[in-house]
C-alpha cells in the first residue's frame, strides 16, 4: 500500500533542522550528534536499528577522542546495576544509569533516558570512526540486561509529544572518503518523529514489522537481474530478516548467499573475478572512472505488503553492493569490495540496502516504509527502485518460527 492516506498532523512535511544530521560512511557506521548530562557533554553516537541500548564510552579508550564523564554531570543517576553485552566477536560492558539527553539537530526536547556507561570493551569501538557510543533504536525485547530497560526511543515518545516514528536516509558517497572528507561530508538524515518528503522520490511502500524485537520483516522473493532465485521463501528469512543500520553489508543466509553469488557471477561473467572478491577479501579495481557498472546485475528483494497476497519490491544497484575502498597501493584506480556476505543469523538488510532508500520506521503502525532515496548513487542507465503491487500468495509461510529459547542466552 502506498502512502496516500490523509496526512496526520506532526507526522509529515518538512523537518529542515534534522536534514543532514548524520555523518559517517557505510563501512564504519552513521552517527548523530547527541548531548548527555548537565552541563551538556557532546558525543557522536552511532545510529543502530539492530540493537536497543543507548550505550556510550565512559572511560578512556585508545580509539575514543572523548567520552561521557558521569562525575561532571549534575543530573546523572546511578542505577547500581551492571550490563554485559557479548557479540559473536567482541563485547562491551558497563554500568547503568540515567541522565538528560538531547539531540541538537533533532526535536527540541530533552529526555531522561537510560544510559549504559561503557567501562570496558573489546572489538566494539572502531579506530577512526569518529563515534563514541551507540543509539540502539530497536525494541525493548532485545535490550540488555533484559527487556525492563526502556530503550531511548521509547523514553523519547513517552516523555514528549514526538510521534512514535523515525526515518533514515543514509547516503553512501559512491567513492572512498579519507578522514578529513568524512568529517566534512554529509552522511544523511535521521528524521525523528516524521517523514521529510524532500528525502525521497516516488511513493513509500510499507511492509509489516513481523515482531517487535529487531525490526523484523519478511522477504517473499529474491531476483537477480529479474531472474527468480527460486528458493523456498522460508530460506530468505532463516532464521529472521531484519533492517539494521548498524551493519555494513547485505548479509544473507548461507544457502541464499551461495545461490545469489552463483547468479551474480553468471550475470557478470564477462570478467573473471577472484574467489576472494566474492568472499569480501580481495578488492577489484578499474581505471578511475571506468567501472563497468553495466556488467553487474540489479538485486530485487520482494517484501510482504500491507494487503493480503500483495508484495512490493526494492531493487538495488551494484553502486550499492560494491563498496568503494581506498587503497594507496592502487590509488590510480577505483577499487571496490563485494558488500554482500554470508550470515548464520538470517538476512540483515544493512547499509548496502539502506543507502538506496529512504526508510521509515513507523513504530506506531508496526510497519517499515521504503522509497527511493533522493541521495542514492546511480548512473544514467539504472536507478534504485521501489515498485508494486505484485500478487504473492502464502506469504505468511515465508516467516521462520524460531524455536523458543531464553533470548538472553543468544549472541548478538
Amino acid at each position: 500500500e502506498t502512502d496516500e492516506e490523509p496526512e496526520e498532523p506532526g507526522r509529515r512535511g518538512s523537518f529542515v533542522e534534522m536534514v543532514d544530521n548524520l555523518r559517517g560512511k557505510s563501512g564504519q557506521g552513521y552517527y548523530v550528534e547527541m548531548t548527555v548530562g548537565s552541563p551538556p557533554q557532546t558525543l557522536n553516537i552511532l545510529v543502530d536499528t539492530g540493537s536497543s541500548n543507548f550505550a556510550v564510552g565512559a572511560a578512556p579508550h585508545p580509539f575514543l577522542h572523548r567520552y561521557y564523564q558521569r562525575q561532571l554531570s549534575s543530573t546523572y543517576r546511578d542505577l547500581r546495576k551492571g550490563v554485559y553485552v557479548p557479540y559473536t566477536q567482541g563485547k562491551w560492558e558497563g554500568e547503568l544509569g540515567t541522565d538528560l539527553v538531547s539531540i541538537p539537530h533533532g526535536p527540541n526536547v530533552t529526555v531522561r533516558a537510560n544510559i549504559a556507561a561503557i567501562t570496558e570493551s573489546d572489538k566494539f569501538f572502531i579506530n577512526g570512526s569518529n563515534w563514541e557510543g551507540i543509539l540502539g533504536l530497536a525494541y525493548a525485547e532485545i535490550a540488555r540486561p533484559d527487556d525492563s530497560l526502556e530503550p531511548f526511543f521509547d523514553s523519547l515518545v513517552k516523555q514528549t509529544h514526538v510521534p512514535n516514528l523515525f526515518s533514515l536516509q543514509l547516503c553512501g558517497a559512491g567513492f572512498p572518503l579519507n578522514q578529513s572528507e568524512v568529517l566534512a561530508s554529509v552522511g544523511g538524515s535521521m528524521i525523528i518523529g516524521g517523514i521529510d518528503h524532500s528525502l525521497y522520490t516516488g511513493s513509500l511502500w510499507y511492509t509489516p514489522i513481523r515482531r517487535e524485537w529487531y525490526y523484523e520483516v519478511i522477504i517473499v522473493r529474491v531476483e537477480i537481474n529479474g531472474q527468480d532465485l527460486k528458493m523456498d521463501c522460508k530460506e530468505y528469512n532463516y532464521d529472521k530478516s531484519i533492517v539494521d543500520s548498524g551493519t555494513t553489508n547485505l548479509r544473507l543466509p548461507k544457502k541464499v548467499f551461495e545461490a545469489a553469488v552463483k547468479s551474480i557471477k553468471a550475470a557478470s561473467s564477462t570478467e573473471k573475478f577472484p574467489d576472494g572478491f566474492w568472499l569480501g577479501e580481495q578488492l577489484v579495481c578499474w581505471q578511475a572512472g571506468t567501472t563497468p557498472w553495466n556488467i553487474f546485475p540489479v538485486i530485487s528483494l520482494y517484501l510482504m505488503g500491507e494487503v493480503t497476497n500483495q508484495s512490493f519490491r526494492i531493487t538495488i544497484l551494484p553502486q550499492q553492493y560494491l563498496r568503494p575502498v581506498e587503497d594507496v597501493a592502487t590509488s590510480q584506480d577505483d577499487c571496490y569490495k563485494f558488500a554482500i556476505s554470508q550470515s548464520s543469523t538470517g538476512t540483515v538488510m544493512g547499509a548496502v540496502i539502506m543507502e538506496g532508500f529512504y526508510v521509515v520506521f513507523d513504530r506506531a503502525r508496526k510497519r517499515i516504509g521504503f522509497a527511493v532515496s533522493a541521495c542514492h548513487v546511480h548512473d544514467e542507465f539504472r536507478t534504485a527502485a521501489v515498485e508494486g503491487p505484485f500478487v504473492t500468495l502464502d506469504m505468511e509461510d515465508c516467516g521462520y518460527n524460531i524455536p523458543q529459547t531464553d533470548e538472553s542466552t543468544l549472541m548478538t
Epitope: 579506530n127 573473471k272 577472484p274 576472494g276 580481495q282 587503497d327 577499487c335
Partner: antibody, heavy 116, light 107 residues
Framework: QVQLVQSGAEVKKPGASVKVSCKAS????????IHWVRQAPGQGLEWMGM????????KYNQKFKARATLTVDTSTSTVYMELSSLRSEDTAVYYC?????????WGQGTLVTVSS | DIQMTQSPSSLSASVGDRVTITCKAS??????VAWYQQKPGKSPKSLIY???HRYSGVPSRFSGSGSGTDFTLTISSLQPEDFATYFC?????????FGQGTKVEIK
C-alpha cells in the same frame, strides 16, 4: 603510510609452538584481511592462510589447517599466527601481508628456526 | 591447487637489457595474477596486479601481460637495482600459489 611490523626471530625445539605477531598501521585495520606466507631457506613462497580483522573469520591452506591458528586483537591492530607441533622443515621466514588486490603490503618477516 | 610454473628459473642479463619472465598456470586464472620482486634478506615487493596493472610507485619499465594461463613480466631496460628474484602468484582461488621464482643475475 601502510606498515606491517612483525615480532623478532625465534628459535624453537621440535614439538614446540611459536606465536608470531604482525602490527598494522597506516590504514583502517578492519578494512583489509591479513595473510601469512612462509619461505623456507632458499625456497619459494607458500601461502598459509588469512584472517578478516573485522570478524576474525579465517581461511587456511589445507596443509596448515591442523597446526596454524590465526587470531586478531583489534584494540592494538595486531594479528597473530601460532604454529604448533613444530618440526625442522618449519624453519622459515614467516611473512604477514595485507590484502587489497592480491598482496600489496608485506611485513619485514620473522625467522623461525626449529632445531633440537 | 593451481600450479604456477615460472621460466626460466634463472637468467643472466646486463644493465639496459630487455628481460622477459613467463609464468604458466595449471588452469585458467583469468587476469588474477600478481608479480613480486624480492632481494636477498628482504620481503617481497609488489610490482604488478591484475596481470598488467602497476602498483603505485612502480617504475614504468616494469610491465605485465597475459590472461587465462599464460603470463609475462617484462623489464624493458634493466637497471642495477632490478637484479633480484621475481615471483608470480595467482590469487584467483585458494590456496594462493606462487611460482618457484626467477633469479635475475648480472651477466
Amino acid at each position: 603510510q601502510v606498515q606491517l611490523v612483525q615480532s623478532g626471530a625465534e628459535v624453537k625445539k621440535p614439538g614446540a609452538s611459536v606465536k608470531v605477531s604482525c602490527k598494522a598501521s597506516g590504514y583502517t585495520f578492519t578494512n583489509f584481511w591479513i595473510h601469512w606466507v612462509r619461505q623456507a631457506p632458499g625456497q619459494g613462497l607458500e601461502w598459509m592462510g588469512m584472517i578478516d580483522p573485522s570478524d576474525s573469520y579465517t581461511k587456511y591452506n589445507q596443509k596448515f589447517k591442523a597446526r596454524a591458528t590465526l587470531t586478531v586483537d583489534t584494540s592494538t591492530s595486531t594479528v597473530y599466527m601460532e604454529l604448533s607441533s613444530l618440526r625442522s622443515e618449519d624453519t622459515a621466514v614467516y611473512y604477514c601481508a595485507r590484502s587489497g588486490v592480491s598482496l600489496p603490503y608485506w611485513g619485514q618477516g620473522t625467522l623461525v628456526t626449529v632445531s633440537s | 591447487d593451481i600450479q604456477m610454473t615460472q621460466s626460466p628459473s634463472s637468467l643472466s642479463a646486463s644493465v639496459g637489457d630487455r628481460v622477459t619472465i613467463t609464468c604458466k598456470a595449471s588452469q585458467d586464472v583469468g587476469r588474477n595474477v600478481a608479480w613480486y620482486q624480492q632481494k636477498p634478506g628482504k620481503s617481497p615487493k609488489s610490482l604488478i596486479y591484475s596481470a598488467s596493472h602497476r602498483y603505485s610507485g612502480v617504475p614504468s619499465r616494469f610491465s605485465g601481460s597475459g590472461s587465462g594461463t599464460d603470463f609475462t613480466l617484462t623489464i624493458s631496460s634493466l637497471q642495477p637495482e632490478d637484479f633480484a628474484t621475481y615471483f608470480c602468484q595467482q590469487y584467483n582461488s585458494y590456496p594462493y600459489t606462487f611460482g618457484q621464482g626467477t633469479k635475475v643475475e648480472i651477466k
